[in-house]
């Protein structure tokens, strides 16, 4: 068998809402993956499990089952959404995300994703992780790859 390549493309969109009373931030983050089947037979994408971390704390998890099949030498682009919650001991971030004197409220999140594929009864897991910028101050739609985390300073907390 040849390889199945998983490429995490980036954040497609991030939709934000707040609970003012609890100082809680809700971020619905939609990510895009490219999965390439380099084989001469179809493979099933059985599930995608994803989690998002902020400051080494898991703030959201998602699992998609029975997603799609990918034909021989084909590629599919898959979007998946992870609902995240920044609350409790991290709800001081509300103070940054709702600050109105700055226009972009980028926070750095670590996106982790594991894709499970099957073919001829054989199962294979491929994992990726990437740091990404997400604006926690407004709803944002990104050009793919636009939110990639570069080696720059994180916002002061």
């Amino acid at each position: 068998p040849r390889s199945i390549d998983v490429k995490y493309i980036g954040v497609k969109s991030a939709y934000v809402s707040y609970d003012v009373q609890k100082r809680t931030i809700y971020l619905n983050i939609t990510n895009t993956l490219n999965i390439t089947n380099n084989n001469y037979y179809s493979v099933e994408v059985e599930n995608i499990t994803a989690q998002v971390q902020f400051a080494k704390t898991v703030i959201g998890k998602a699992r998609l089952n029975n997603i799609t099949h990918i034909g021989p030498l084909d590629m599919k682009q898959i979007d998946y959404t992870v609902p995240t919650v920044i609350a409790e001991e991290m709800s001081y971030m509300y103070d940054f995300c709702t600050l109105i004197s700055i226009k972009v409220h980028n926070i750095v999140l670590m996106m982790q994703v594991t894709v499970t594929t099957t073919y001829f009864g054989h199962s294979e897991q491929i994992s990726q992780e990437r740091y990404q910028y997400v604006d926690c101050g407004r709803n944002t739609t990104y050009q793919l790859g636009q939110s990639e985390y570069l080696n720059v300073l994180q916002p002061q907390q």
Epitope: E89, Y92, I100, S101, Q157
Partner: antibody, heavy 123, light 111 residues
Amino acid sequence: EVRLQQSGPELVKPGASVKISCKTSGYTFTDYYMNWVKQSHGKSLEWIVNINPNNGDAFYNQKFKGKATLTVDKSSNTAYLDLRSLTSEDSAVYYCAREGQLRLRRVYAMDYWGQGTSVTVSS
Amino acid sequence: DIVLAQSPASLAVSLGQRATISCRASKSVSISVYTYVHWYQQKPGQPPKLLIYLASNLESGVPARFSGSGSGTDFTLNIHPVEEEDAATYYCQHSRELPYTFGGGTKLEIK
């Protein structure tokens, strides 16, 4: 210099409404949340509401919902407090106060205050 | 609503001595390392003036004789050495959640 200039004293009849203003200068109006605070004669302070001047989102003390309405006019850098169905309980000094902030976070303390507007409700 | 109980209601302190004002919250007003309590000074006929924000940070232009401390539910404003111009009423305020509330005030008299 940051300034919050409030409108003058008001004497109104019970059941009437009043609109008091807070004209700001010396800073970017849309960069700071604005609050209103009530102080009855010889008493402590009561927070009424705060507003995001960018989008008009206002967050009220439930006690004042239906009594107070906060609006802003971005073109004149002015905040307004509307008080309706006035009773003697509403007689007080009303202050507008800007919410201060650090470089990258809100602190929710009120760093600049208007001089206060006295509202007297009497028949 | 979070209730802030200030004590004493009034106190008289000799010039140059220490004034200590307490503020107790009915529940914690801290999140992580941040404590959402602020202190104000008000003189008759004037609006309140911010002295201390986030429990212990001195507002710009406020003399260093003012200091704040505490976390969770118990907070203190200290003034040392007290000067004549410090005669005023002092209020604590929390901003941990809505609605923000103020303490009942402490009236400081200089002997």
